[in-house]
């Protein structure tokens, strides 16, 4: 969490951003809130990115003004216009690119004063793994697949019966580049598993951590998955 305060002759207002991560090729949100104002026409929101000449987005007098928007953000940004009056300056970003990573500034002017806060935006790819029994194999194996990751993650397996101990010798992981030549498909096979045990496939890079669990019994297969973004901190 980053909290910024305005300076200058005018009073300062508190602006709060949240460090977040964007999933390449998907739509993202850059979070920013500020002390609300009762008059929409008095509110100016400017989003800027370090190293970029033009603006990322500007909202003033109750509507967007994209006259000075940088070409790299053309047709890709929007604020939640109906929530601005309540202090929400968060930015919607379409089709997140690797190059969108960087330091952004959320700059606010209201009748109460000015304020700004920086936001670190990380970009990468992350997806929930699916764990299945690999029936094609001669032994009882588990196959963990996740379609999109970047940068290349680490993969570890753990077993409940072994008190969460990691298996290093008995699994094999491969990374296959996807068609857009950035993200990769992750496939990991765990060999010689035993029945009535819960196994976890854990995939992690510096942006996200995902887990796929599977429990195989004589009568059923139970699955569970979880994805957690790392380093979401407020400013």
């Amino acid at each position: 969490l980053i909290i910024g305060f305005g300076i200058s002759g005018r009073h300062s207002i508190t602006v709060t951003t949240l460090t977040s991560a964007g999933n390449i090729g998907e739509d993202g949100i850059l979070s920013c809130t500020f002390e609300p104002d009762i008059k929409l026409s008095d509110i100016v929101i400017q989003w800027l990115k370090e190293g970029v000449m033009g603006l990322v987005h500007e909202f003033k007098e109750g509507k967007d003004d994209l006259s000075d928007q940088d070409e790299m953000f053309r047709g890709r940004t929007a604020v939640f216009a109906d929530q601005v009056i309540g202090g929400n300056a968060s930015l919607r970003l379409k089709n997140v690119q690797l190059t969108d990573a960087g330091t952004y500034k959320c700059y606010i002017i209201t009748s109460k004063g000015k304020g700004n806060a920086n936001l670190e935006y990380k970009t990468g790819a992350f997806s929930i793994p699916e764990v299945n029994v690999d029936y094609n194999a001669s032994s009882e194996n588990l196959r963990c697949e996740a379609p999109r990751w970047f940068p290349q993650p680490t993969v570890v397996w753990a077993s409940q019966a072994d008190q969460g101990a990691n298996f290093s010798e008995v699994f094999n992981t491969s990374f296959e580049l996807n068609s857009e030549n950035v993200t990769m498909k992750v496939v990991s096979v765990l060999y010689n598993v035993t029945i009535n045990n819960t196994y976890s496939c854990m995939i992690e890079n510096d942006i996200a951590k995902a887990t796929g669990d599977i429990k195989v019994t004589d009568s059923e297969i139970k699955r569970r998955s979880h994805l957690q973004l790392l380093n979401s901190k407020a400013s």
């Epitope: 998907e26 006259s67 928007q69 047709g75 929007a78």
Partner: antibody, heavy 120, light 107 residues
Framework: QLQLQESGPGLVKPSETLSLTCTVS??????????WGWIRQPPGKGLEWIGN???????YYNPSLRSRVTISVDTSKNQFSLKLSSVTAADTAVYYC????????????WGQGTLVTVSS | EIVMTQSPATLSVSPGERATLSCRAS??????LAWYQQKPGQAPRLLIY???TRATGIPARFSGSGSGTEFTLTISSLQSEDFAVYYC?????????FGGGTKVEIK
């Protein structure tokens, strides 16, 4: 409500320049949350996005047509225009102008369209 | 560019029946997809944007679903005025592209 109306010659000779104008009424072309776009549709075929312009004059064109297309805006007349150079018979189409959301980028509303035939 | 493929090319349906139109993108477009209706001699009309949000004034019998690469437009009970050509359009990345259209005709 907002309305768009295309105007321009219905017949253009091969190798010449096609010129169309779209007049916006019932609203300002300076409305901040919108681009203004051109789309075309050859007879009996599908739709092709040509490009768009913001009221400040910044443009974006379809790469397949970029070398031949110019879109301009005249805010004083509440109009924007399309020029397509070096036309051939393949450019024969109904040309539509439309308001394009800045994001989401849907087209709404559309002009009624004008048929431009390229023939000598 | 992203290629949009619609199926079927023609759909024959009786009035009152349900119509299901498909649109597939050559790569993920998230939810950045719109649907349009076009009648002969008329301009297209926006029905759906954001894959599932109905445009202003569009009847509830029109609904959109899907995300990523697979999308569906459903007309729950076809009225006589619904017989037309329907186009999907992706606005995920430039250049924006349209599908080839699905003609919904009276059976």
């Amino acid at each position: 409500q907002l309305q768009l109306q295309e105007s321009g010659p219905g017949l253009v000779k091969p190798s010449e320049t096609l010129s169309l104008t779209c007049t916006v009424s019932g609203g300002s072309i300076k409305s901040g949350s919108y681009y203004w776009g051109w789309i075309r549709q050859p007879p009996g075929k599908g739709l092709e996005w040509i490009g768009n312009i913001y009221y400040s004059g910044s443009t974006y064109y379809n790469p397949s047509l970029r070398s031949r297309v110019t879109i301009s805006v005249d805010t004083s007349k509440n109009q924007f225009s399309l020029k397509l150079s070096s036309v051939t018979a393949a450019d024969t189409a109904v040309y539509y102008c439309a308001r394009e959301g800045s994001y989401p980028n849907q087209f709404d509303p559309w002009g009624q369209g004008t048929l431009v035939t390229v023939s000598s | 560019e992203i290629v949009m493929t619609q199926s079927p090319a023609t759909l024959s349906v009786s009035p009152g029946e349900r119509a299901t139109l498909s649109c597939r993108a050559s790569q993920s477009v998230s939810s950045n997809l719109a649907w349009y209706q076009q009648k002969p001699g008329q301009a297209p009309r926006l029905l759906i944007y954001g894959a599932s949000t109905r445009a202003t004034g569009i009847p509830a019998r029109f609904s959109g679903s899907g995300s990523g690469t697979e999308f569906t437009l459903t007309i729950s009970s076809l009225q006589s005025e619904d017989f037309a050509v329907y186009y999907c359009q992706q606005y995920h990345s430039f250049p924006f592209t349209f599908g080839g259209g699905t003609k919904v005709e009276i059976k």
